[in-house]
């Protein structure tokens, strides 16, 4: 089943080189990996590894194609009907509560507990207590962050030239 | 209390290589990114390159590759770099720098000077 | 690379004033951007993360917005010791790169 995407789902994208036309819009929507013209007549193909669209839509511009950030792999690349998929770099995954961060995985449990659960590009290794079986959740205590330059010597004045 | 307490200053001649040491208190590097950024007299920062000490992965800024290299003790909880074929210009502070995301620094040291002279 | 530009080089403002520094990135790097303060001597020292989360421990006074291109960090009202140099720095992509740095200064 289709869902519909229109035009005030996205931000428009300027179009950088012509594209090649297609068939006539059906019903006023034109397919997957298209977008309609401005007079509505024809349906543009997106710009492959540029832009895409999922599904029938009424779309002035196709969808901006996601870059991977520093802190992901790419696992496929955007095509015209897909956007990229991105995850978490080995060693890292993406909290819920911030979706747009890759977190490194801690590498140990807490004292009294054991490691019950591998990282994964979605979750933190998985510890329980030794006893009880419980949970834990939350971070290692020197793992958090508060920030603060170390203390030591002053390294050199560091000024701005020009 | 999470501190990076890098090695002493250091005077070397063209040429020479130098290798500088951070060792951090406080948290288990492998559970962290550890960076490093140089500083050049009355200059700005230039990041120079990222490992992760859980497995070893680095990434270096082109224009430091085969300049710098970066590795880690995991047993002594100590981070290093080493410069080769110093230059004047390679003269700068550099820090050692946390992070518990690969995409900002929380925690830097109070850096090491490397001046580069004859 | 993505080059980070930072205006003005040098800003002159009052204590107690408000003080204003631009970032701008040579792409959109979405909100993948963090603002740091160097005093004299010092290590520098995170302030604001992700264009505009604030840090444990920075007071609240420090405020950064914007998103893509365009990056603000705002400084409420002036105290003595925020006269320093800011750099920002985006995460985005690889390498990592830093602005050239503003010096607030005592006007």
């Known amino acids: 089943e289709s869902a519909l995407i229109t035009q005030q789902d996205l931000a428009p994208q300027q179009r950088a080189a012509p594209q090649q036309k297609r068939s006539s819009p059906s019903e006023g929507l034109c397919p997957p990996g298209h977008h309609i013209s401005e007079d509505g007549r024809d349906c543009i193909s997106c710009k492959y590894g540029q832009d895409y669209s999922t599904h029938w839509n009424d779309l002035l511009f196709c969808l901006r194609c996601t870059r991977c950030d520093s802190g992901e792999v790419e696992l496929s690349p955007c095509t015209t009907t897909r956007n990229t998929v991105c995850q978490c770099e080995e060693g890292t995954f993406r909290e819920e509560d911030s979706p747009e961060m890759c977190r490194k995985c801690r590498t140990g449990c807490p004292r009294g507990m054991v490691k019950v659960g591998d990282c994964t590009p979605w979750s933190d290794i998985e510890c329980v207590h030794k006893e009880s079986g419980t949970k834990h959740s939350g971070e290692v205590p020197a793992v958090e962050e508060t920030v603060t330059s170390s203390p030591g010597t002053p390294a050199s004045p560091c000024s701005l030239s020009g | 209390e999470v501190q990076l307490q890098q090695s002493g200053a250091e005077v070397v001649k063209p040429g020479a290589s130098v290798k500088l040491s951070c060792k951090a208190s406080?948290?288990?590097?492998?559970?962290?990114?550890i960076h490093w950024v140089k500083q050049a007299p009355g200059q700005g920062l230039e990041w120079i390159g990222r490992?992760?000490?859980?497995?070893?992965?680095?990434k270096y800024d082109p224009k430091f590759q085969g300049k710098a290299t970066i590795t880690t003790d995991t047993s002594s909880n100590t981070a290093y770099m080493e410069l080769s074929s110093l230059r004047s210009e390679d003269t700068a502070v550099y820090y050692c720098?946390?992070?518990?995301?690969?995409?900002?620094?929380?925690?830097w040291g109070q850096g090491t000077l490397v001046t580069v002279s004859s | 690379e993505i080059v980070m530009t930072q205006s003005p080089a040098t800003l002159s403002v009052s204590p107690g004033e408000r003080a204003t520094l631009s970032c701008r990135a040579s792409?959109?790097?979405?909100?993948?951007l963090h603002w740091y303060q160097q005093k004299p001597g010092q290590a520098p020292r995170l302030l604001i993360k992700?264009?505009?989360q604030s840090i444990t421990g920075i007071p609240a006074r420090f405020s950064g917005s914007g998103s893509g291109t365009e990056f603000t960090l705002t400084i409420s009202s002036l105290q003595s010791e925020d006269f320093a140099v800011y750099y920002c720095?985006?995460?985005?992509?690889?390498?990592?790169?830093f602005g050239q740095g503003t010096k607030l200064e005592i006007k």
């Open positions: 720098v946390r992070g518990l995301y690969t995409y900002y620094f929380d925690y």
């Open positions: 406080g948290f288990n590097i492998k559970d962290t990114f």
């Open positions: 490992i992760d000490p859980a497995n070893g992965n680095t």
């Open positions: 792409q959109s790097i979405s909100n993948n």
């Open positions: 992700f264009a505009s």
């Open positions: 720095q985006q995460g985005n992509s690889w390498p990592y790169t």
